[in-house]
């Protein structure tokens, strides 16, 4: 099953994907597509790289902001909308027949968080919270935690795009979160 990542409307979403160039610097083409990985290539391509750089992007909202030359081909989608929700395919196109590495990741875009109790802080999920939930039978995957994270207890309902923040004990440092006073 694909791993799920959460982002809030209007913020940036981060979908991780990486490989280890062998030897170092020996890059391979990568494509990102909207929809689960198909048998061949990527369908509905949103971004494509060649052996040197990004050479195709369907929108200026799609970026590779990691160290591309070290194999970090994680996709950043800027200013996400509900329409960006869904499964994305990261396909690492290793030379040879049927050698490609295929990774399906699911982006869940939620409406701006409702916060209780008042007064409240409303923040974006994009990089403030651990972004990974897992589905399937293999247990939780390693949580992505860029920067310093606040100590937050949260519940994300599968059915209601609502986030409730019960405690907030740390300042938001280096997390890219936006603080807005209600």
């Amino acid at each position: 099953s694909e791993v799920e990542y959460i982002a809030e409307v209007g913020q940036n979403a981060y979908l991780p994907c990486s490989y280890t160039p062998a030897p170092p610097g020996n890059l391979v083409p990568v494509c990102w597509g909207k929809g689960a990985c198909p048998v061949f290539d990527c369908s509905n391509v949103v971004l494509r790289t060649d052996n040197r750089d990004v050479n195709d992007r369907t929108s200026g909202r799609y970026w590779l902001k990691g160290d591309f030359h070290k194999g970090d081909v994680s996709l950043t989608i800027e200013n996400v909308t509900l329409a960006d929700s869904g499964v994305y395919c990261c396909r690492i196109q290793i030379p040879g027949i049927m050698n490609d590495e295929k990774h399906n990741v699911k982006l869940v875009v939620i409406k701006p968080a409702k916060v209780t109790p008042a007064p409240t802080l409303q923040r974006d999920l994009t990089s403030a919270f651990p972004r990974m939930l897992t589905t399937g039978e293999h247990g939780p995957a390693e949580t992505q935690t860029p920067g310093s994270l606040p100590d937050v207890n949260l519940t994300v309902s599968n059915f209601f795009c609502e986030l409730q923040i019960f405690t907030l004990t740390n300042e938001l440092r280096d997390s890219g979160a936006t603080i807005r006073t209600a």
Epitope: G35, A36, C37, P38, V39, F40, D41, S43, N44, V87, I97, M98, N104
Partner: antibody, heavy 116, light 107 residues
Framework: EVQLVESGGGLVQPGGSLRLSCAAS????????MTWVRQAPGKRLEWVAN????????YYVDSVKGRFTISTDNAKNSLYLQMNSLRAEDTAVYYC?????????WGQGTLVTVSS | EIVMTQSPATLSMSPGERATLSCRAS??????LAWYQQKPGQAPRLLIY???TRATGIPARFSGSGSGTEFTLTISSLQSEDFALYYC?????????FGQGTRLEIK
């Protein structure tokens, strides 16, 4: 208008060879994946082979591996399927189509009959 | 390989009626499903890809839905030219496979 036209089908004896051609027009042939699909009488469609233009990667269904070879000639905007060691079960209408995962458009097809 | 099963094998309908064709995959193919229409003596024609996206030039009366293992092609109001053979095709798993087809015939 995007168009694909197959040729080269016919009657051949078991163990024989045949080369199918597909002439493409109306699009930049060299940038697309191209595919062969066949349909045996009364049977469902069967994906046979495809080729990744540029990279040159070629993929085949198991039943034709080692016997069929897919290729292109970008100068002629043409797709080919070289079929060797033909068997009775290869009898079908062979279609060329544009695309890797879903196919649009398709040619009108060419009939290959393998019989003694 | 993934087995695609279409039902019914034959569907008898009248022009103007709503037709619903089903396709089931033996395991999940996500949204990687296409539908084709084929008329006698002609090549297949792409109708739908990505389970629900209409191909270029396909009338709005054709719609696709479903995800995972269950898919549906709906023709909202049948026209005389819609009576044909319809195939589904998955493109998640190797090798690409097609359903056996549903024949839509005039009642």
């Amino acid at each position: 208008e995007v168009q694909l036209v197959e040729s080269g089908g016919g009657l051949v004896q078991p163990g024989g060879s045949l080369r199918l051609s597909c002439a493409a027009s109306g699009f930049t042939f060299s940038t697309y994946w191209m595919t062969w699909v066949r349909q045996a009488p009364g049977k469902r469609l069967e994906w046979v082979a495809n080729i990744k233009q540029g990279g040159g990667d070629k993929y085949y269904v198991d039943s034709v591996k080692g016997r069929f070879t897919i290729s292109t000639d970008n100068a002629k905007n043409s797709l080919y399927l070289q079929m060797n060691s033909l068997r009775a079960e290869d009898t079908a209408v062979y279609y060329c189509a544009r695309g890797s995962n879903w196919f649009d458009p398709w040619g009108q097809g060419t009939l290959v009959t393998v019989s003694s | 390989e993934i087995v695609m099963t279409q039902s019914p094998a034959t569907l008898s309908m009248s022009p103007g009626e709503r037709a619903t064709l089903s396709c089931r995959a033996s395991q999940s193919v996500y949204d990687n499903l296409a539908w084709y229409q084929q008329k006698p003596g002609q090549a297949p024609r792409l109708l739908i890809y990505g389970a629900s996206t209409r191909a270029t030039g396909i009338p709005a009366r054709f719609s696709g839905s479903g995800s995972g293992t269950e898919f549906t092609l709906t023709i909202s109001s049948l026209q005389s030219e819609d009576f044909a053979l319809y195939y589904c095709q998955q493109y998640t798993h190797w090798p690409i496979t097609f359903g056996q087809g549903t024949r839509l015939e005039i009642k």
